[in-house]
Structure formats: structure tokens, C-alpha cells
């Protein structure tokens, strides 16, 4: 168990724990104090004791010892009084820290005393050696507990230069692979640096005498170190491994390292000392095996095999941990260690080896674990697990502390929990005690809640309630109890409505540049704070102040100016403080493809065959498969900025060989196309020019035609520049009269035409036009027939007759003309005709002529749309390219037809049962008018009750209809007639119904002169005629309000003029109908001095 921080009010004791101790190995130098450290924590206060070499050691009783008087410290310091005092205190120390709960133990601290380093007195003989031989200068420094550093110097304290030939070994000896006369010195001094004592001592100088020789003899390598052929060594896991090979020989050997048993771990291996030393960092099990050094020179080699065994000091797999336990629990301390060789594990309890304890103890040791069952407070102890092998020792202290604590609920009482329907609520009841208290949850009735399978308890006391329902709202009680006491808390649960997205956003596919709207509707519990937010690919979306990319409002997300980067998943997040629901939609942005990113030309050698290979990288398809790629070219010389398509290839292709034209400066580009259209084109390719070649095409549309009677103009469609196949092109034109088989005349021209002069009129010629450039001629051209210039035709068409088809159409026929008289290609016939006048009366108006062009192979024409009852003049002419020939003439007349519609039919209401119809005759009589036909019927009777009668007077302009119903509307139809029958009708609708009743003066106004006033109005179409009075009344004192006698006026009149008025006078005008006042207006006459005439065209009565 672990006592929670919130569990207050219980002062728990603590077993001893070592917090600080001296290192396992302590080397003391002559002038140093000895400090042995041992500190520990614990409640009650810890007592310390020491052992040396397993025997009780009392620091306080030793001379020169200072013990630190500190509650958590058992450390002490020994101060010496002479240089070798430390020798007396050498040994293995251990510290024990105890209180009433147990004893903790430090690791073994090995104290070693190091004396002042001295080189044993020796006489160093000179070393004599012949040039080229090898030599070893020994160093043999005194032994040291701490690593030391060796340097070789001369008496001037200059380092001896080391290289492949001269090397210091790890042992400090100086090795010469071969000596040179320049090595001859009497002061090779080995210096040993002891960092612990901060002293450097030096060996007696060695005198190296090198005898010169005239013949240095080459010899193969031999190892100076190690001297035997193989050696075995142990490397410690995690430590560095250093292997060394030093060889002699002449020339100087080089050293190589091999690992026959596997690969050399390059990341951890370094070679030093001119390859003589191999250092392997952080040795691991896999480094076990053979390492071989090879010394080579031109005469041979020598080798040494190192057989490395990797071993390891003990290390933890599972270190025992201190724990608190409640009564009755089982305590298990795991002590799993590894090492090579396998370490031996021993257990201690409170510092005493278990072997020395009484046999009736309740612990058992099983597979590296110390186990105590059913622990009680009296079983509290500190255990030690110690593992050792020949490479080291490992120690762990771990306590078993058995405590008794009353039950306590650490969760606050009377907490309110809120959760939504369908979710899971968690009611907390964190309880603690020793033994661990049992926890029960009860409802308001004191019944256990666990009868409902939706309620489930957790080991930590929490009660879970899944699939929450509204009626789960209420109070719940948590009861915690152990053998010392029991406690209760209450929890309130409120179940709210779950948030629901009633209509989420829908997945959609949209075009780039368009906008998309996602909508989201949700329902929330009314007591909770609602929120709707939007996420795009997991990122929160917000309207950005400086951009109108996103618009968010009322559950709507609008994304403007869609780009491909906007593609992704968009979700509406509806949330309250209790729950979050999310509805997701996918947005795919589609559009035309992206640009082709890269374009490369290859097989440029094919340019000589007018081909090249184009390859490109695929374009982004923007969610619509690429259907095709369009390959285009531009010629910057001939047509800059103009792109021509060379063809399209399927969308799964990314290269093609193109067929090109000679001498074109090709720059290519490729565009991807999908169903949304073409993308941006690729970057342009480099420009390549195809070699020149003779033309492969000749001009088309070759024609020969004269533009004068004595010439022939040969024309053709010039070759497009891309067909020139060279920088320029010319045209070889050949011609000869047709059928002569004589020689061709020819001329080479640059323009797309040639004028052949002095030709006879309308002679056929054979013509050929061939393209020519600097590389040669085009293919053999085709022969075209052309003609020299035409003259006006001399042929007159002979008329065969005119057939009258009806009153407005005739058929004209003529005989084909003699082609010899045409003087050119007969293009057809011009037929011209015009109306000379009606048969009724001849008009003097301007004559309008109509033309019909008839093809050469046709000798008749129907002239339609003629006016009936009219005289026409007709001319027919043959025509060729030059113009028209003489005309044949003829006159004909069209028979009578039916007339056009009468003009302007007006309805004038006479009473509520009678109407006056007023009209004008038709514009086109098309014959002799014989009268009119009038028909009418009520509109709402669907055409029943039609009345029709003939008005036989062609001069008639009005007709009065009586006995009409005042309640009906009628349809009136009036037709004029000739002997051919009635013509087109004019139609009006109306009746007396809407037109009688209250009179309407419409737009009425008055104007005045000096002595008169004109009142005018616009009569309403069909308004029944009526009579009314107009009264002029003068205003002002001197006028005395004098009135003129009222005048009777007819409505159809449209205006009335009142004379005999006073100048410069205001008048009121009153309008009466059947003594009822209908309208009033005012007018003022002008002052004197004006012409006293009324305006022209005004009627007076």
C-alpha cells in the first residue's frame, strides 16, 4: 500500500533508508584525510554502527577521528599525523543504520592507502643497437591503485615523436620497429604521472646508441607485443576493451585488424596509435570472439589472435522495492540479477544474513524472491539482497513496513455529479486504510446498487453507472469499512439530456474556386451551455480577421474560394460542459489537373528523321482521372506566343515520340486534361530545330482565272510556314494550253499568285504549282485546269412562256443559252421583275425591282409573293464571271385576289344596347372591292350564337349595331370582299357593359388665350357618348362672380372653346351631367396686347 497525501492526521513511522554513502573503492593518498560517508533517513531517529573487515568498528574510539554530530549522519573523518597513517585504516568498511523498524546496510567500502610513488633505484645500461634493428626501451613504472599516465621525453622536456615506427605501448614501453641513426640519443626518459597524488616521477635516462651500417637488411614483421601467437582476455560488459599489437621489421610494418568471428562494430571501434591500438567502446555480449591483428610489410606478415570472452559484473533485472503493507497481506521482494559468471545471491534481514537467523522465521525464499505471507505489524523489517561474482557486488535495501490505519474516505462528501443520458457516470469514493477497507455503494433506501447490472464498482472505490437514464438522478451513499472503523459519504447524481446532432454536414464534391456550405443542427439539454464549432482535419476552424476564407454562423460553415488544400474531413462539434458529439463530412475538391511539373526531351538524334521523344512527370489529377495529355509546340521564330497541338495521348502515358516537320524551331509544352478541362501547361521545353528538308507538300486550292479578258491569274493557298521545311519557300508555277501536249511554261515566284498575260479570251490551261526550297522541290504536283479571262455574254435567253399559278405566283420558263455565246463559264441567269402598277389605277411611285439568281443548269423559276391584280415587267439575262449579257423582256398581269384586312376598326358606344362600328378600307384591295362581311358573337358562349351579315356597299365606313346585351362582351370580326371572296379579318372585342355608367373625362385640361379658353380631354376607347354642360364662372370682386350661360357639349367632341372671356381674369370651370356636379378646374386668361386668335385646329361650338 501507499499512504495517499490526503490521508492526514496519522504520524506514520519510517524504516531506515541509506541516502548517501562513500564509493565502493576509496583510495587515500599520504597527505589526504580519510572521509567515510554514511547517511540515512528514518523515523524515529536512526542509529549508526560500522564494521571493518567484518568486525565492529567504533569511530569515536579511534585517535584523530571526527564523527559528524547530525541526526541523519554516521559519517566520520580521520585526520592523520604522519604520511603513512592511512595504512593502519585499510580494510573493508560497512555502515548499519537502525531504528525500531529495522536496519539498513551500506555497500562494502574498500579503503586503500597509496604511498608516495617512487621508482626503485636502478642502474640503466646504455642500449646498443645496429641501424635498422628493433629495440624496446622499458619503463616499468611503480604499481598504482589508480590509473597513471606515461610520457617519454628527452632532457629538454620535449616529447619523443611517435609514428608508425616509434610507438609507446599501453604498458609504457617505447617500441622501435627499426632504428635510424637519428634515434641516437642519451636521454630517453620515461615520466610517470600519478593524478591522485598530483606527482610526476621520472626514470633514469636511457642512452640509446645506434651503430650506422651501410647495408640495412629488410626483414619481415615480428610482434614485439604481444610476443606469443595468441592470448585470451576477459572484457567487461559496458566497459571499453583495448587491444594492442606492436610489430618490428624493415620496412616499418603496417597494422590491420580483422574479426574472423563477425563484422567489426564500426560505430563503436576506433583505431589509435597509428592503428596499433583497437579500442572498442561499451563492450556487449555480441563482441565475444576472436580479434586478429596483422602486421605487414613488403617481406611478409606476422599476426596475433586475441580471444575475447565478455563477462559482466552483476546487474539488476529486478531490484527489490520498499513497500507499505496492511495486516494480512503477502509481501514479496523480488531480487533478480544477471552477470557473467552468474552471481551468487544472499539475503539479509536487518543486516543479518538469513543463515544466521532462527529457523522458525515466517519468510521463505523462492526463485530469487523473499516472500512473507499474512504479514502483521511485528513483521516490519529492512531486507538486504546482495549479489556477487568475481567482477563485483550489488546490494539493495528494501523494507517491508506493516501498518494499521483506520478507514477514511478521501473523496469530499455531498459532491454533485452531472452526466448525460446514455453515457457512463463515475461517482468517486477514494478510501484508504490498513487493512484496505471494503467499499459498498447504497441507494437512498440503503439497498446495494449492484443488483442493477448497469452499476459496476472499480477497485479504487469508484462506482460506474453505464447507459444512464433520466431516473438514475438521485442520492447515492458510499460506505468504507475495515477492522478499525467505518465511514460514509453521499454523492448526488443529475442525469441530463444528451446532445444530439439532428442534421450533420454531408460529404460533397466541389469544384476549385467555388464555395461550399456545411450545415449542422443539434439539440441540447436546456440547462446546459450549448456550443457548435467546426473542425477541419482535426484543427479548430475560426473566421480569420484578415481573410474571408471561412464564414461561420448559426450552425453553418461556408468555405470560400475552394482550393485543393481545403480538401479533407470537416466535422461539426456540438458540445456542452458534459458531452461532445461530432458529425463528419468529407470534402473533395475537384478541378482541372495541376501543371505537368517536368518535361524532358530525349532521343534528339531522331531530329534528323523529324522525330523526338518527349517525357514528362504526371500532373496532379485533382480527384478526377487525367483523361489525356495534350502536347503542343510553339515556333518562337515564325509564330511566337502561338501554340499548336501536335496531338493528345492517353492520361496513363507519360512519354511519346512525336512526328515533326523539318526546319521548325520547336518548343514543347504538355497540358493534362480531365473532365473539368485542361490544367496549367508544363514549363516549356528547350528549343530544338529540325534539320532542313525539301518540301513534302505542294500548295492547294490552285486556280486559274482571268481578271481581264486577256490574262489568266494563277492563285493558290500558300504553304503554312510549318510546311516550308526551310527558312524560305518559293513556288514553281507551270502552265500550258489544255490538250496541246506542248512544252510547259514555268516561273518561280515567292508571292502566292502569278499573272499570265496576252491570253485569248476564255481558253482552258493546264496548271501545276510546286513548292521549292533550298533543299529541293516538293512532290510532283497535280494538274489543275484554269481559264483565261472571260468577256460579257452575248447570248439572249429565249422565253418559252409564263404560266399564272395563282393571284400571287407565276412560273417563268426559257430555253438554255448557246454556251459558245456565253464567253466564259455560265454562272447562271439573273431574273429581274417589277410591278408596273395596279390594274385599278396606275401609280407614279418609285419602282422597286426584285431579283432572282437561277443556277446555270436550271431554265425556269417560280416568282411568288406577287401582288394580285397587278401588271409586272420581267427581264432574263445569262451571266458569267465577267457580268450579265443582254436581257429578254416580257410583261404579264396577275388576276384578282382577296383583299387585305380593313384598317382601324373602332367601337363607339351609343347606348347600353347599341354600338357604332367605324372602320377604314383595306390598304391592299387586290381587286375590285364588293363590300364587307361583319360577324360577331358573345365571348362567354364559346362561339355559339354567331351572327353574320353582308354589307354590300364598298364605300361604307360605319355600321350601327342594336339589341346588344348590356351584360356581355362581344367579339367583332370585319372582312372586306372582292369577287374572289372575303379577305383577312380585323378583330375587336368589346360591348356596352363596361363602357356605360359613370362618365370618365380621362386626362382633362384647360388652356387660355386673352378672351378665350380651350377645354380638352381624351375620350376613352368605346366609352358611350353622352352630353354634359360646361360652365365658366369669373372670380374676383369687380367681376362679381359673373357666370356665362352653361354650354351643352358632346363627349365625342374631345374639346370645347369658350369665347367672350375677360382678359387677365381667373375662371372656375364646372362640368355637370344630368344636373350632377362632375368636375371642377381653374384657368386664367392672358393680359391685353396679344393677338386675339384661338389655337389652330380647335373645334368651336
Amino acid at each position: 500500500i501507499q499512504i495517499p497525501e490526503e490521508y492526514e492526521g496519522h504520524h506514520v513511522m519510517e524504516p531506515p533508508v541509506i541516502t548517501e554513502q562513500s564509493p565502493r573503492r576509496l583510495v587515500v593518498f599520504p597527505t589526504d584525510d580519510i572521509s567515510l560517508k554514511c547517511e540515512a533517513s528514518g523515523k524515529p531517529e536512526v542509529q549508526f554502527r560500522w564494521t571493518r573487515d567484518g568486525v565492529h568498528f567504533k569511530p569515536k574510539e579511534e585517535l584523530g577521528v571526527t564523527v559528524y554530530q547530525s541526526p541523519h549522519s554516521g559519517s566520520f573523518t580521520i585526520t592523520g599525523n604522519n604520511s603513512n597513517f592511512a595504512q593502519r585504516f585499510q580494510g573493508i568498511y560497512r555502515c548499519f543504520a537502525s531504528n525500531k523498524l529495522g536496519t539498513a546496510m551500506s555497500h562494502e567500502i574498500r579503503l586503500m592507502a597509496e604511498g608516495a610513488p617512487k621508482w626503485p633505484k636502478e642502474t640503466v645500461k646504455p642500449v646498443e643497437v645496429e641501424e635498422g634493428e628493433s629495440v624496446v626501451l622499458p619503463c616499468n613504472p611503480p604499481p598504482s591503485a589508480e590509473p597513471l599516465r606515461i610520457y617519454w621525453m628527452n632532457s629538454k622536456i620535449l616529447h619523443i615523436k611517435q609514428d608508425e615506427r616509434v610507438t609507446m605501448g599501453q604498458n609504457g614501453n617505447l617500441y622501435f620497429a627499426n632504428v635510424l641513426t637519428s634515434d641516437n640519443h642519451s636521454d630517453y626518459i620515461c615520466h610517470a604521472h600519478f593524478p591522485g597524488t598530483r606527482t610526476i616521477i621520472q626514470k633514469e635516462p636511457i642512452d640509446l646508441r645506434v651503430k650506422a651500417t651501410n647495408s640495412m637488411i629488410d626483414r619481415k614483421p615480428r610482434l614485439l607485443f604481444p610476443t606469443n601467437s595468441s592470448s585470451h582476455l576477459v572484457a567487461l560488459q559496458g566497459q571499453p576493451l583495448v587491444l594492442e599489437c606492436i610489430a618490428e621489421g624493415f620496412p616499418t610494418p603496417t597494422i590491420k585488424w580483422l574479426r574472423p568471428s563477425g563484422p567489426m562494430p564500426a560505430d563503436r571501434v576506433t583505431y589509435q596509435n597509428h592503428n596499433k591500438t583497437l579500442q572498442l567502446l561499451k563492450v556487449g555480449e555480441e563482441d565475444d570472439g576472436e580479434y586478429r591483428c596483422l602486421a605487414e610489410n613488403s617481406l611478409g606478415s606476422a599476426r596475433h589472435a586475441y580471444y575475447v570472452t565478455v563477462e559482466a559484473a552483476p546487474y539488476w533485472l529486478h531490484k527489490p522495492q520498499s513497500h507499505l503493507y496492511g495486516p494480512g497481506e503477502t509481501a514479496r521482494l523480488d531480487c533478480q540479477v544477471q552477470g557473467r559468471p552468474q552471481p551468487e545471491v544472499t539475503w539479509r534481514i536487518n543486516g543479518i544474513p538469513v543463515e544466521e537467523l532462527a529457523k522458525d522465521q515466517k519468510y521463505r525464499i523462492q526463485r530469487g524472491a523473499l516472500i512473507l505471507s499474512n504479514v502483521q505489524p511485528s513483521d516490519t523489517m529492512v531486507t538486504q539482497c546482495e549479489a556477487r561474482n568475481r567482477h563485483g557486488l550489488l546490494l539493495a535495501n528494501a523494507y517491508i513496513y506493516v501498518v494499521q490505519l483506520p478507514a477514511k474516505i478521501l473523496t469530499a462528501d455531498n459532491q454533485t455529479y452531472m452526466a448525460v443520458q446514455g453515457s457512463t457516470a463515475y461517482l468517486l469514493c477514494k478510501a484508504f486504510g490498513a487493512p484496505v477497507p471494503s467499499v459498498q455503494w447504497l441507494d437512498e433506501d440503503g439497498t446495494t446498487v449492484l443488483q442493477d447490472e448497469r452499476f459496476f464498482p472499480y477497485a479504487n472505490g469508484t462506482l460506474g453507472i453505464r447507459d444512464l437514464q433520466a431516473n438514475d438522478t438521485g442520492r447515492y451513499f458510499c460506505l468504507a469499512a475495515n477492522d478499525q472503523n467505518n465511514v460514509t459519504i453521499m454523492a448526488n447524481l443529475k442525469v441530463k439530456d444528451a446532445t444530439q446532432i439532428t442534421q450533420g454536414p454531408r460529404s460533397t464534391i466541389e469544384k476549385k474556386g467555388s464555395r461550399v456550405t456545411f450545415t449542422c443542427q443539434a439539440s441540447f439539454d436546456p440547462s446546459l451551455q450549448p456550443s457548435i464549432t467546426w473542425r477541419g482535419d482535426g484543427r479548430d476552424l475560426q473566421e480569420l480577421g484578415d481573410s474571408d476564407k471561412y464564414f461561420i454562423e448559426d450552425g453553418r460553415l461556408v468555405i470560400h474560394s475552394l482550393d485543393y488544400s481545403d480538401q479533407g474531413n470537416y466535422s461539426c462539434v456540438a458540445s456542452t460542459e458534459l458531452d461532445v458529439v461530432e458529425s463528419r463530412a468529407q470534402l473533395l475538391v475537384v478541378g482541372s489537373p495541376g501543371p505537368v511539373p517536368r518535361l524532358v526531351l530525349s532521343d534528339l538524334h531522331l531530329l534528323t528523321q523529324s522525330q523526338v521523344r518527349v517525357s514528362w512527370s504526371p500532373a496532379e489529377d485533382h480527384n478526377a482521372p487525367i483523361e489525356k495529355y495534350d502536347i503542343e509546340f510553339e515556333d518562337k521564330e515564325m509564330a511566337p506566343e502561338k501554340w499548336y497541338s501536335l496531338g493528345k495521348v492517353p492520361g496513363n502515358q507519360t512519354s511519346t515520340t512525336l512526328k515533326l516537320s523539318p526546319y521548325v524551331h520547336y518548343t514543347f509544352r504538355v497540358t493534362a486534361i480531365n473532365k473539368y478541362g485542361p490544367g496549367e501547361p508544363s514549363p516549356v521545353s528547350e528549343t530544338v530545330v529540325t534539320p532542313e528538308a525539301a518540301p513534302e507538300k505542294n500548295p492547294v486550292d490552285v486556280k486559274g482565272e482571268g481578271n481581264e479578258t486577256t490574262n489568266m491569274v494563277i492563285t493558290w493557298k500558300p504553304l503554312r510556314w510549318m510546311d516550308w521545311n526551310a527558312p524560305q519557300v518559293q513556288y514553281r508555277v507551270q502552265w500550258r494550253p489544255q490538250g496541246t501536249r506542248g512544252p510547259w511554261q514555268e516561273q518561280i515566284v515567292s508571292d502566292p499568285f502569278l499573272v499570265v498575260s496576252n491570253t485569248s479570251t476564255f481558253v482552258p490551261y493546264e496548271i501545276k504549282v510546286q513548292a521549292v526550297n533550298s533543299q529541293g522541290k516538293g512532290p510532283e504536283p497535280q494538274v489543275t485546269i484554269g481559264y483565261s479571262g472571260e468577256d460579257y455574254p452575248q447570248a439572249i435567253p429565249e422565253l418559252e412562256g409564263i404560266e399564272i399559278l395563282n393571284s400571287s405566283a407565276v412560273l417563268v420558263k426559257w430555253r438554255p443559252v448557246d454556251l459558245a455565246q456565253v464567253k466564259g463559264h455560265l454562272r447562271g441567269y439573273n431574273v429581274t421583275y417589277w410591278r408596273e402598277g395596279s390594274q385599278r389605277k396606275h401609280s407614279k411611285r418609285h419602282i422597286h425591282k426584285d431579283h432572282v439568281v437561277v443556277p446555270a443548269n436550271t431554265t425556269s423559276v417560280i416568282l411568288s409573293g406577287l401582288r394580285p391584280y397587278s401588271s409586272y415587267h420581267l427581264e432574263v439575262q445569262a451571266f458569267n464571271g465577267r457580268g450579265s449579257g443582254p436581257a429578254s423582256e416580257f410583261t404579264f398581269s396577275t388576276p384578282e385576289g382577296v383583299p387585305g384586312h380593313p384598317e382601324a376598326l373602332h367601337l363607339e358606344c351609343q347606348s347600353n344596347t347599341s354600338l357604332l362600328l367605324r372602320w377604314q378600307p383595306p390598304l391592299s384591295h387586290n381587286g375590285v372591292l364588293t363590300g364587307y362581311v361583319l360577324s360577331y358573337h358573345p365571348l362567354d358562349e364559346g362561339g355559339k350564337g354567331q351572327l353574320s351579315f353582308n354589307l354590300r356597299d364598298p364605300e361604307l365606313r360605319t355600321h350601327n349595331l342594336t339589341d346588344l346585351s348590356p351584360h356581355l362582351r362581344y367579339r367583332f370580326q370585319l372582312q372586306a370582299t372582292t369577287k374572289e371572296g372575303p379577305g383577312e379579318a380585323i378583330v375587336r372585342e368589346g360591348g356596352t357593359m363596361a363602357l356605360s355608367g359613370i362618365s370618365d373625362f380621362g386626362n382633362i385640361s384647360a388652356t387660355a388665350g386673352e378672351n378665350y379658353s380651350v377645354v380638352s380631354w381624351v375620350p376613352k376607347e368605346g366609352q358611350c357618348n353622352f352630353r354634359f354642360h360646361i360652365l365658366f364662372k369669373a372670380l374676383g370682386e369687380e367681376k362679381g362672380g359673373a357666370s356665362l350661360s352653361p354650354q351643352y357639349v358632346s363627349y365625342n367632341q374631345s374639346s370645347y372653346t369658350q369665347w367672350d372671356l375677360q382678359p387677365d381674369t381667373d375662371y372656375e370651370i364646372h362640368l355637370f351631367k344630368e344636373r350632377m356636379f362632375r368636375h371642377q378646374m381653374a384657368v386664367k386668361t392672358n393680359g391685353t396686347g396679344r393677338v386675339r386668335l384661338p389655337p389652330a385646329g380647335f373645334a368651336t361650338e
Partner: antibody
Framework: QVQLVQSGAEVKKPGSSVKVSCKAS????????IQWVRQAPGQGLEWIGY????????DYNQKFQGRVTLTADKSTSTAYMELSSLRSEDTAVYYC????????????WGQGTTVTVSS | DIQMTQSPSSLSASVGDRVTITCRAS??????VAWYQQKPGKVPKLLIY???TLHSGVPSRFSGSGSGTDFTLTISSLQPEDVATYYC?????????FGGGTKVEIK
Amino acid sequence: QVQLVQSGAEVKKPGSSVKVSCKASGYTFTNYWIQWVRQAPGQGLEWIGYINPSTYYSDYNQKFQGRVTLTADKSTSTAYMELSSLRSEDTAVYYCARRQFGLPLFDYWGQGTTVTVSS
Amino acid sequence: DIQMTQSPSSLSASVGDRVTITCRASQDVGTAVAWYQQKPGKVPKLLIYWASTLHSGVPSRFSGSGSGTDFTLTISSLQPEDVATYYCQQYSNYPLTFGGGTKVEIK
């Protein structure tokens, strides 16, 4: 007359970068692609890459991909070649050359820039 | 990449001699081969393209021939000013590659 003038000699440390310039005159800079070629001491010619000064589109010899960057400045009619992660074998004379209008040939050359890479 | 192998790597001839340099491509390059002349301390200069077409301003004593994989540059009458190194170049495919060069000296 057509001229391509390159920047002066450079001495660089291994691992560093060098940027060589090539100023064009006497023709319309954007109408012709600029190619880069190098020549190691006593060795032959090696093509590095090209740039279209009109669109700045460039392509490189795969051997130099990732180490070479070709750029151009229309306003000064200058092309640039930058080579990074220099090694001793990059010691060479670097030439810019104008690509002939219709074929990948070199009709006008810069005077060359010597780049020495040495620690 | 297309390898261009030139031979000989150097030659020595007398003024007026006919000199022939050959260039072999590792694959068919049609006639997409050019020849350059580089005089000591100078920049290369285009002599021939399309294997045999003389570049403007190049003396007529220079000629080229060949197609496919084997190409030849011929100097019909060696002049002192022709002392230079000559390079062939293929432009059929990228990367553009050059021959190793042939150094021509006067005896």
C-alpha cells in the same frame, strides 16, 4: 557582341558551398538557356545542368542532384550556380555557356571560374 | 548515361598532315554528336554539329563523319593554330556527355 562574364576564383573548405555568377550581355537574356559545365584539372568536360532564364525552370545532371542549384535574375541578366557540400573532387573550372537556339550545344562560353576545395 | 570514348588521348603530327580523331558512343546516338576545340588556357569552341555540319566561321579543313556509335573528326591539313584538345559531345539524351578529349600537338 555576345559576352558571358563569370565571377572570380574561389577557395572553399570541404562541406561548404560556393556560388558562381555569370553575367550575360549582347543578346536577349531570356531567349537562350544557360548551361553549366565543369572541367577538373587535366580532365575532360562534365555537364552540370541548365536553366531557362525566362521561366527559371532548371534541370540537373543526376550526379549533382541535391547539391546544385541554378538560379537567374532577369533584371541583371545574370545566372548563378550554387554547389553545396563541397568535396575535394569538386575542384575544377566551372563554365557557364549559352545554349545554341535550336540544339543543346554550347555556342558562347564564359571565361570560367576556378573553384578550389581544400582543408 | 551515354559514355563517349575518345581515341587517341593524345597525338603528335606534322604541319600539313591529315589528322583523324575518333569517338565511340556507348549506345546509338544517330548523328547527334558535336565536336569542340579547346586551345590551351582558352574556353571550348564549337566546331561541328550533327556529326558533319560545320559551325559558322570554322575553316573547311575540319570535317566530321559517322553515325550510330562511331564518329570521326578529321583535320585535312594540320596547321600550327590547330594545337588544342578536341572533345566530342553527344546531345541525343540527357545528361549531355563529353569524350575524355584528344590532345593534338605539332611534331
